[in-house]
Structures are given as C-alpha cells and as structure tokens.
C-alpha cells in the first residue's frame, strides 16, 4: 500500500512568548514544529516515529497564522508518506520549538527550546475530508487539521489496492474509488480487454478487435456476419453454410448453372400444349388436338378432329370446314337423321328406340360400340388419358398407358426419380433424363457416375474442332466431341460430304 498522512497547521498562539520551562523568548519565540507519526499507542512513548517524521522551518514569532504553501521550504500541509497498508489508527506528536538559529533549518541549530507539545491518538479512515482540531494548554493554542489520502494509483480503505488507468490491449479502463476497474465505453471483461462488437454481430461467425466492429470469419459476409458466402461462381443457388451451392428449383450442376426446368423458365410450348422437362435444356411439347410441330406452333387441318358425324365426309375451307352428309343425314355435322327404326339404322347389334312419335330414333349400343348408329368401336384413348408423353393402347374393353422411362402409374402420372438413390459419386450433380440419370461431374472427376478420378482435364487442350462441344465424364479418362450440324469425326474435324469410303463415322 501507499498513502500520505497530511497535517495542515492553521494557527499558533503564544501571546506571552513563553517557553515550556516558563522562560520567555528574547526578543520573541521564533517558532518551528517537529511532527512524529507512529503506530497507535494507548500511552504515547518515546521511540522511533514508525509512520514517519517531519520538521518545518521557522513559521512565525509567538502568535501567527500558517498559510498554505505548495512547494519549497515551509510547505503546508505537511506530508508524511507511507508505503504500507494504512491500519486505520495512529499516534501523532506535534511539538512547537523556539530556535535562536537558522530560519530554514532550525532543526540543526544548538540551543533549541521546547515551547509546547500535543499528542493525538485515535482512529482515522482514509478520505478526502479534513478532520479539524484545536489543542490548548496554559500558555499556547494550536489549530490544525489532518487527513490520510492514498498516493496516486492507490485505492481502497487502506490504500492497499494498486490500480493504474490504462488504454492499451492489456486493458481499457479507469479506476474506481475502491480500486476496481471501470471499463471505458465499448470494452468489457475482467481486465476490460474484450471489445463490445457491433450490436447483433454473430457470436461465432464474427468478431472484433475494437468496439462497434464486426469482422467476418472466412465464409461469412454481411454487416453482422450472418450471411454465408456461396461457392465461387454459384449462379442460381444459395448456401446455408459457407462455400455451398444449393441449387434453386429447376437448376442443376456444380454451379447451379444448368437449366433443369426449361419449361417454366422459357415456356417454349405454344397453343396451350403441355411442356415436359427432360434434363438440362431438354423438353417435350405435347400438343392439343389441331396442332403439331416441335413447339405445337403449327395448326393442323380443320378436319383433323373428325367433326363430321354419321359417316359424313369433311372438306377444309379457308377458316372452316364443310361436312358432306350421307343419305338420310343432315345438319352442320350430319348430326340429324331422316331415318326411322323401320330403316334398321343401328349397327353392331344396337337396338333402336323410336322418338317423337316415330319421326326419329335413338340407338342403344352394346358394349365397346358408340356413335349415333353404334357404328364406331369405342376408342378409350381419345381422351388422351396418358400423361407425360405415355402411349395409350386399347386392350379389348379397357385401355392401358405405356409410360416413357422415368414415369409410372395408371396414367403415367408418377415421376420415378433415378436420382433418389444418389448415383453420382464425388459430389456430382444428378439429372433425371429419359434414358436414366446423368451425372454432371465436378472438376477432376469423370465417368457415367463421376466415379473416375482424372489427373487432368481432357477437354483443357481444346481437342474438338469446328465449334464442337467437348465433354468429359462420358467415357473414363477420355473426352467426347458433340459435333455441330455438318461435321463428323471423333473430333468433328471432317465436313459432311466426304467420299463414302471415308473411314470416320460421326
């Protein structure tokens, strides 16, 4: 510990100029003081001043007021420093002396005489408030005050706690009256060495080296470091952990740059036709009746839907069609009959029922026949019941759907995912195609299932000519060139039209 006992001398009165032995001072009592501070004693005894001692120069003659003085000789208040834990109790002896000698160093002069002395014993807590007192005897009076304060950087009830304010990386704090640390704004922790990061900064993914900062750890971004950084080059994907590229719906490939949902993104099928995806950039259009073409962009003949009934023949016209009705029928679609049951109009065992008092009829057809005269065999495939490009087949009284690869169900309405069993190795991306799954391999792997580790990229040297596209991963440790129209050869190096005997086959 470390502190200072301070004694402020205020006024000394010795009106008659007398010494303790009853003699008078000539011409007056030139007065200086000796102060002895020691540990508490119930009865003050001579001996070492264990807490310190100090003497003053001559401060006045007989009676005088002592002014405060901060430096040099005659400093007031008097300072008695100590380097130990203040015990809270003390004994103090103040002696007034007369000197005939040197004003500045009367202590060294011979012939000094005691004027008076006072002894104070008691308790005193550390604090800034002065304790004021006055002591009288028959000849003199002394007014004074005293206190104990801690030295700079020492705190607490006994000045035993060392604390130095600091503002560096071992602490950013000031000192409280009890010596505990008071962190500067923006800092926390036992030693006030931990910065308080920007409010909301992610605890794991962000950190700071100074207050109100948020530095992101690798793989994270954003003001609060709560957004992951996706794989470099990720096009149509997101991440939930850094460097991930989880593809948005309809996209595939390592960088989610392969369009698996061409139908939705581009709507290539026209005239209300149905679009079915079939792998990256692949699709099929299923046309409504009356349309054809790759995108169902071509309108069929107006007669294509067989609008003429009862054996009427159809003839295309500019924006319409015309039905030529057989004998006994009339109407736009030959739907009206001039026949009656007497003409036996019902075929295939259909039974005739008269209507409108015998002026018309209706045929009740046996199973598997239809038409107003039961002339048509039932085609259960006319309603296009098979979805996803399935083929409809009549089987006696029923029909079945023959599904395309990758689909199942009574109407081919269920999609079989070949990718469900994760056939692609080494992080390859799987795509369901008509002829089974296809794997898009990451760099460094090839093969139908990305199972082959390649030591170099076979396509890197650009082996395909004439603008052909190079693919690795379709055959182990090799490449395949997909030739543009008009070129053939394993590297697409030969234009079509070479002699038939030429050995290369596209």
């Amino acid at each position: 510990g470390s502190g200072i006992f301070q004694l402020r001398l205020q006024e000394f009165v010795n009106q008659r100029g007398m010494l303790a032995n009853g003699q008078s001072c000539e011409p007056g009592c030139r007065t200086f003081f000796r102060i002895c501070l020691k540990h508490f004693q119930a009865t003050f005894s001579e001996g070492p001043c264990t807490f310190g001692n100090v003497s003053t120069p001559v401060l006045g003659t007989n009676s005088f007021v002592v002014r405060d003085k901060n430096s040099g000789s005659g400093r007031n208040p008097l300072q008695l420093p100590f380097n130990f834990t203040w015990p809270g109790t003390f004994s103090l002896n103040i002696q007034a002396w007369h000197t005939p000698g040197d004003d500045l160093r009367p202590e060294t002069s011979p012939g000094n005489s005691l004027i008076s002395q006072i002894i104070i014993q008691g308790s005193l807590a550390v604090g800034k408030i002065w304790r004021t007192d006055e002591q009288n005897d028959t000849l003199t009076r002394l007014s004074y005050s005293y206190r104990v304060i801690c030295s700079d950087n020492y705190y607490g009830e006994s000045c035993s706690r060392l604390c130095k304010k600091r503002d560096d990386h071992f602490g950013h704090y000031e000192c409280q009256p009890d010596g505990s640390l008071s962190c500067l704004p923006g800092w926390t922790g036992k030693y006030c060495d931990q910065p308080i990061c920007l409010s909301g900064c992610h605890e794991q993914n962000g950190y700071c080296s100074k207050p109100d900062e948020c530095i992101c750890r690798p793989g994270w971004q954003g003001r609060l470091c709560n957004e992951c950084i996706p794989h470099n080059g990720c096009r149509h994907g997101t991440c939930s952990i850094p460097w991930q590229c989880a593809c948005d719906e309809g996209w595939g490939g390592l960088f989610c740059d392969q369009d698996l949902n061409y139908c939705t993104h581009h709507s290539p099928c026209k005239n209300g036709s149905t679009c079915s995806n079939s792998g990256p950039k692949g699709y099929t259009c299923t046309c409504l009746p009356g349309y054809t073409g790759e995108h169902c962009e071509l309108g069929l003949s107006k007669c294509a839907s067989n609008p003429c009934r009862n054996g009427g023949s159809c003839k295309d016209q500019e924006n319409s069609y015309h039905c030529l009705c057989p004998p006994g029928y009339y109407g736009q679609h030959c739907e009206h009959s001039t026949l009656t049951c007497a003409d036996s109009p019902c075929f295939n065992g259909g039974s005739c029922r008269e209507r409108n008092q015998g002026s018309s009829y209706a045929c009740e057809c046996p199973p598997n026949f239809t038409g107003s005269n039961c002339e048509k065999k039932v085609d259960r495939c006319t309603s296009n019941p098979c979805a996803n490009g399935g083929q409809c087949q009549n089987r006696g009284p029923s029909r079945t759907c023959r599904c395309r690869p990758g689909f199942t169900g009574t109407h081919c309405e269920l999609h079989i995912s070949d990718c469900a069993r994760s056939p692609c190795a080494h992080g390859g991306t799987c795509h369901d195609l008509e002829n089974g799954p296809v794997c898009t391999c990451p760099a460094g792997f090839s093969g139908r299932r990305c199972e082959v580790r390649i030591t170099h990229d076979a396509c890197a040297s650009g082996p395909c000519f004439n603008g052909a596209t190079c693919y690795t991963g379709l055959s182990p440790n090799n490449f395949v060139c997909n030739c543009p129209y008009g070129f053939v050869g394993s590297r697409c190096e030969f234009p079509v039209g070479l002699p038939p005997s030429f050995p290369w086959v596209a």
């Epitope: 060392l162 130095k164 071992f170 036992k190 030693y191 060495d193 080296s209």
Partner: antibody
Framework: EVQLQESGPGLVKPSETLSLTCTVS??????????WGWIRQPPGKGLEWIGD???????YYNPSLKSRVTISVDTSKNQFSLKLSSVTAADTAVYYC?????????????WGQGTLVTVSS | SYELTQPPSVSVSPGQTASITCSGQ??????ASWYQQKPGQSPVLVIY???KRPSGIPERFSGSNSGDTATLTISGTQPMDEADYYC?????????FGYGTKVTVL
C-alpha cells in the same frame, strides 16, 4: 506446465523473409487470458519487443518494425508465427516467443528457449 | 518513441542491497515489469505491476514505481543473482524494454 518452443531456419539471406513458428504445449493458445508475443535480442545487446497476437487474430506491432512484420495464429495447431520481410544483417538476433499475461499487466511469464537467426549471404 | 533508461552496471557485495533504477517519462503512471536474464538463458519475470512477485521468485526481490522512476531492489544479494536485469513497460500498445543493467556480485 505451459511450454513454448521456437522453430525455423537458423540462416536467412539478406532481402529474404525470416519465418519462425512458436508451438505452445501444456495449455491452449485460445485462452482469453494471454497474448502471444515475439521478442528479439541481437548478440550482446538488449531485448526488443517485436509484436504480439491474441487468439482471435488481433495483432499489435512495434512501430519501428510494423512495415515488415506479420504475426499470425493457428489455433488448431496451437501455434503462432512470425514473418519478417526484407531482412538485413541488423535483424540477426536470438528470437524468443513469450506468453504475455493479462493478469500480470502484460508481463511475460513464460518464454521459449530462443532460436538464433543469422542473416547472411 | 518511448524510452526507458537504466544504468549499464551495478556492483554489490554479497548480502548487501542492490537497487536498479529505470527512468521514463511519467513511468509511475504505467505498470513496470522486471526480467532477470543469465548468460545463455531466456529472460525470467521477477516483478510485475511495479511490485508483485510471480510464484517461485524469492522475497528478496522487490519493486516500486512512482514519478518517473521504477526501482528493483535485491536485498541480501546472493552470488546467484548476478545477471542482466531489464525493466519493461507498455506505451499504449507497444512493449518497451530498458537497455539493461548488469548486476555484478563482488
């Protein structure tokens, strides 16, 4: 007990980069109670503080060396490293790594045994 | 830049008291540490935060720091105390060492 061990080449050519690693054993470099520092001592001369690092990666460098010094930490290996670029003969010294304790006001309570690095062609 | 000044050498007889000073501007407002270094060995911390001793350091080592001067005192000096002694303080975020004092036990 915590121990520190410096490692790296003892000879570096002028203008090249001096690289040293300090491996901490018997304790975690990720403790929030310590900074991890580098101090050097040219032959026959006094100690010079180079810089230090916290487990989070926060670094502090001697202004006189700042333009040439990089200190990094690898918590997974319990190591921290020093790189000093564009070295000259004046960088010849024994290089110490040390643990600087927050509880001791930044005093270095643990030191490595030191490694002599000579800069010479 | 901040500097700490030490006397190059101090001589002391066995059993006597050796005092090593370390001076720097307003050093008393900073915490001072002291290191002992024997030939061919790494430094050892003997005093931190002006006057505190790490465990294992003998009681004969004590320290004080006020004004512009920190002092390391070795009371009852022993021959094994012969070594170089360095003071150290932090100036903002930079560690600063004194030039060192060689203590010779006569």
């Amino acid at each position: 007990e915590v121990q520190l061990q410096e490692s790296g080449p003892g000879l570096v050519k002028p203008s090249e980069t001096l690289s040293l690693t300090c491996t901490v054993s018997g304790g975690s470099i990720s403790s929030s109670s310590y900074y991890w520092g580098w101090i050097r001592q040219p032959p026959g001369k006094g100690l010079e503080w180079i810089g230090d690092i916290y487990y989070t990666g926060s670094t502090y460098y001697n202004p006189s060396l700042k333009s040439r010094v990089t200190i990094s930490v690898d918590t997974s290996k319990n190591q921290f490293s020093l790189k000093l670029s564009s070295v000259t003969a004046a960088d010849t010294a024994v290089y110490y790594c040390a643990r600087q304790a927050l509880a001791m006001g930044g005093g270095s309570d643990k030191w490595g045994q030191g490694t002599l690095v000579t800069v010479s062609s | 830049s901040y500097e700490l000044t030490q006397p190059p050498s101090v001589s002391v007889s066995p059993g006597q008291t050796a005092s090593i000073t370390c001076s720097g501007q307003r050093l008393g407002d900073k915490y001072a540490s002291w290191y002992q270094q024997k030939p061919g060995q790494s430094p050892v911390l003997v005093i931190y935060e002006d006057s505190k001793r790490p465990s294992g350091i003998p009681e004969r080592f004590s320290g004080s720091n006020s004004g512009d001067t920190a002092t390391l005192t070795i009371s009852g000096t022993q021959p094994m105390d012969e070594a170089d002694y360095y003071c150290q303080a932090w100036d903002r975020d930079t560690g600063v060492f004194g030039y060192g004092t060689k203590v010779t036990v006569l």
